[in-house]
Interface confidence: low
């Protein structure tokens, strides 16, 4: 069967479709037809998009031509440019691909020209008269998302029949644009209609999960379910998975979320990604990647050892200075052969007794007025009153290797009466005295929140360090960390910069540009000026919430809010053309950066289909104004103002009869 005598056909990816309409039309008629369906003439700007067009067009008859969305006004030759002065009907000239059939002609370009694609061979581009009616045209439709084609079911009478928003009906789609309808006919007589809709959890999906056709319940093949099959009251079957597994997108098979999870140490099903990673005792999640585990340096925790501490992978050991020996608790030191540490032992027990109520603990907290200082490699306590210094408090970025805190000069030897915390590998690792790393600590029990006693005299509220409430929505409560109270004299909270947390409670994929099967944005490199934050995650900005009730006495609370930081695209690499014509690479001209897309997919608002016609270039603020389609003269006779928020350049159809008299090449395909 001649495909050119057949109905229109389309090829869809996850975010755009190309459709071939085998209808004889002029360029203007073709452009108008695509626009009326909510799309635009095709704009294959990359080798990958060209491949999709190739697969759709197939091997057509040798002489057939199809309009694509490229046109050039009279006297607009720019032969040195990749598009030779042609402009996409979306209004721009950005491209990473060209496929001209012939080298550029050196003439003066006296007439408006349009581009058609050969239906055979390598689908090269030919320029010719826009008023010529060619064999068909290619449209392109962008959309917010797509549903995968439905799996065939045992009880189906035939394949699902799909109807797209641009009125194409076929059984052959791999992806169905948002708004498509699937009609399934069942052997038992009744059928089902499904709509590709937005899902509450984000993305798009079919309005109903399978199975769609009433079969023989769960027999004979367990209803197609991998694990458990449940026969519902209405005769439908639904599938369930055994504990620790989750139902896959097909509604039938079961997945072990931890099987594919890239956790370095321990994985647990659940959480927004379907799994959450945990680290063994003595380790904590890496700040740059919560899937990896790094050794907790317990020696950085104030008071973890009474005198000296040595960290090793997975744990730590306490040591005592000469003349002292380590007590049985592995933490305290006493003079050799004496019981001199009993005072500190009592104080430590009072501070950290699990049975104490909050008031008592608070009193104990205020009982010790000593400061603490740090020497490289050794943590120890000093009972001297610290000077009233202002804390230079900053987020812990890679370039800030140490917090800028003017410590008093250390004294030696270390005293014996310092408060301490007991030997718990579960104690939060605070690698810098005041900055809390917002990653999942490995806590064996929610009943033992680690408290790090390093107190000073009661300070006015203005001088209290805010406490960070580090909440982890994707962790079970047993993994929630306790509050870390670290009171130092500090600047008033208003002067503190916002902390940037490196924890992302919900990891949504960045919006993807319309390409298939792996989407990308050609020619855009996005960088943020925030070290340590993955580029495809929106960082959380921790902002001060002074109006909130305090989490602990005399402490302000910092709560994480999912505030989107503006992401500023840096200078973008220029797009370059790919030419299938035998042109040497020296002829490849880079498109200047000024013509690059200025918008970032991650930040694009939800767009209507008419605004999605350009897969690479979202609308530029500096795009040129729409050109009004003209027929046989300068004044528009047709109301072609279709609603579209995107500035698009409509083609123009100049009366070319007069021009043809001057140039006999006008109506030929060059």
């Amino acid at each position: 069967q001649d495909p050119w005598a057949a109905e229109p056909r389309a090829a869809c990816g996850p975010s755009s479709c190309y459709a071939l309409f085998p209808r004889r039309r002029t360029f203007l008629e073709a452009w108008r037809a695509c626009r009326e369906l909510g799309g635009d003439l095709a704009t294959p700007r990359t080798p990958e998009e060209a491949q999709r067009v190739d697969s759709l067009v197939g091997a057509g008859p040798a002489s057939r031509l199809l309009w694509i969305g490229l046109q050039r006004q009279a006297r607009q030759c720019q032969l040195q440019r990749p598009l030779r002065g042609f402009t996409w009907t979306t209004g721009d000239q950005d491209t990473a691909f060209t496929n001209w059939a012939q080298p550029a002609s050196g003439g003066p370009c006296p007439a408006q020209r349009c581009v058609a694609l050969e239906a055979s061979g390598e689908h090269r581009w030919l320029e010719g008269s826009c008023t010529l009616a060619v064999d068909g045209y290619l449209c392109q439709f962008g959309f917010e998302g797509a549903c995968p084609a439905l799996q065939d079911e045992a009880g189906q009478a035939g394949p699902a029949v799909y109807t797209t928003p641009f009125h194409l009906v076929s059984t052959e789609f791999e992806w169905l644009p948002f708004g498509s309808v699937a009609a399934v006919q069942c052997q038992a007589g009744r059928g089902a209609s499904l709509l590709c809709v937005k899902q509450p959890e984000g993305g798009v999906g079919w309005s109903r999960a399978g199975p769609l056709c009433l079969g023989t319940g769960c027999s004979p093949d367990n209803g197609g379910c991998e694990h458990e099959c449940v026969e519902e009251v209405d005769g439908h079957v639904s599938c369930r998975c055994t504990e620790g597994f989750r139902l896959a997108a097909d509604g039938r098979s079961c997945e072990d979320p931890c099987a594919q999870a890239p956790c370095e140490q321990q994985c647990e099903p659940g959480g927004p990604q379907g799994y959450s990673c945990h680290c063994r005792l003595g380790f904590r999640p890496a700040e740059d990647d919560p899937h990896r585990c790094v050794d907790t340096d317990e020696c950085q925790i104030a008071g973890v050892c009474q005198q000296m501490c040595v960290n090793y992978v997975g744990g730590f050991e306490c040591y005592c200075s000469e003349g002292h020996e380590l007590e049985a608790d592995g933490i305290s030191c006493s003079p050799a052969g004496a019981m001199g540490a009993q005072a500190s032992q009592d104080l430590g027990d009072e501070l950290l007794d699990d049975g104490e109520d909050e008031e008592d603990e608070d009193e104990a907290w205020k009982a010790f007025n000593g400061g603490w200082t740090e020497m490289p490699g050794i943590l120890w306590m000093e009972p001297t009153q610290p000077p009233d210094f202002a804390l230079a408090y900053r987020p812990s970025f890679p370039e800030d290797r140490e917090p800028q805190i003017p410590y008093p000069e250390p004294t030696w030897p270390p005293p014996l009466s310092a408060p301490r915390v007991p030997y718990h590998s579960s104690v939060l690792s605070v690698t810098r005295p005041v900055v809390v790393s917002a990653t999942h600590p490995t806590l064996p029990s929610a009943h033992q929140p680690p408290v790090i006693p390093a107190t000073h005299p009661a300070l006015s509220r203005d001088h209290q360090i805010p406490v960070i409430a580090a909440n982890y929505p994707d962790l079970p409560s047993a993994y929630q960390p306790g509050i870390l109270s670290v009171s130092h004299s500090a600047q008033p909270p208003a002067h503190q910069p916002p902390m940037i947390s490196t924890k992302y409670p919900e990891l949504f994929p960045a919006h993807q540009s319309p390409m298939f099967p792996d989407t990308r944005v050609a020619g855009t490199q996005t960088t943020t000026h925030l070290p340590g934050i993955p580029p495809n995650h929106a960082p959380l900005v921790t902002t001060l919430g002074a109006q909130l009730p305090p989490q602990a006495p005399d402490a302000l609370v910092l709560r994480t809010q999912a505030t989107q930081l503006p992401i500023i695209p840096t200078a973008q690499p220029s797009l370059t053309t790919t030419s299938r014509s035998p042109v040497s690479p020296a002829h490849q001209i880079s498109v200047p950066a000024a013509t690059q897309p200025a918008a970032l997919p991650t930040l694009l608002p939800s767009q209507s289909p008419t605004n999605q016609t350009s897969p690479i270039s979202p609308t530029h603020p500096h795009s040129k104004a729409p050109q009004i389609p003209r027929e046989d003269g300068p004044s528009p006779k047709l109301a072609l103002w279709l609603p579209s928020p995107a500035p698009t350049a409509a083609p123009t159809a100049l009366g070319e009869a007069g021009l043809a008299e001057h140039s006999q090449r006008d109506d030929r395909w060059l």
Partner: antibody
Framework: EVQLVESGGGLVQPGRSMKLSCSAS????????MAWVRQAPTRGLEWVAS????????YYRDSVKGRFTISRDTAENTLYLQMDSLRSEDTATYYC?????????WGQGVKVTVSS | DIVLTQSPTTLSVTPGETVSLSCRAS??????LHWYQQKPNESPRLLIK???QSNSGIPSRFSASGSGTDFTLNIKNVEFNDVSSYFC?????????FGAGTKLEIK
């Protein structure tokens, strides 16, 4: 699971022909470009040929144009490379790869030795 | 044809080190540059597509950057398992071309 399995390699004399096959499974074969890539110890990785989704569009490196033919049987989910007029410089391990611009899945490779 | 030049040819590192591998194109390839890893006696495996997008299942220790003609593959905290040859490839224009590769060895 995506799988590509090549077959048909071996020893062949210069000037003779050989046909390689690649059986594909685990994905919708008709939706993907496919390619052959070869690797000779002296030359590193070398793209040989690609075919469009329908098999109608084919691309070849200059040194094999006119001698090699890439084709596909969508019904059988199989990719082929017909190699005629073989030369000693065609000696290499030939990989079948799924190609959407980049090569995201590769077969285990099949060794072709052209020698008299 | 677009020629891709990789450097160094061989790189010998200590486990735990961070290394950078370079790939330079004779003409701009836009963002159509990809990286592969090939372990001894194995088929190549896609690491990075389109300059910096990690392929699924690739450890986050592997990252890449660049644009136009200069590209870099970075490997943090090198492990024994990373002993491989690393190739860059362009899909900007036919013929598709690969770099000659960088061989990573462990001291």
């Amino acid at each position: 699971e995506v799988q590509l399995v090549e077959s048909g390699g071996g020893l062949v004399q210069p000037g003779r022909s050989m046909k390689l096959s690649c059986s594909a499974s685990g994905f919708t074969f008709r939706n993907y470009y496919m390619a052959w890539v070869r690797q000779a110890p002296t030359r590193g990785l070398e793209w040989v040929a690609s075919t469009g989704t329908g098999g109608d569009f084919t691309y070849y490196r200059d040194s094999v144009k006119g001698r090699f033919t890439i084709s596909r049987d969508t019904a059988e989910n199989t990719l082929y490379l017909q190699m005629d007029s073989l030369r000693s410089e065609d000696t290499a391990t030939y990989y079948c790869a799924r190609a959407y611009g980049y090569f995201d899945y590769w077969g285990q490779g099949v060794k072709v030795t052209v020698s008299s | 044809d677009i020629v891709l030049t990789q450097s160094p040819t061989t790189l010998s590192v200590t486990p735990g080190e961070t290394v950078s591998l370079s790939c330079r194109a004779s003409h701009s390839v836009g963002t159509n540059l990809h990286w592969y890893q090939q372990k001894p006696n194995e088929s190549p495996r896609l690491l990075i597509k389109y300059v910096s997008q990690s392929n699924s299942g690739i450890p986050s220790r592997f990252s890449a950057s660049g644009s136009g003609t200069d590209f870099t593959l970075n490997i943090k905290n090198v492990e024994f398992n990373d002993v491989s040859s690393y190739f860059c490839q362009q899909t900007q224009s036919w013929p598709l071309t690969f770099g000659a590769g960088t061989k990573l060895e462990i001291k």
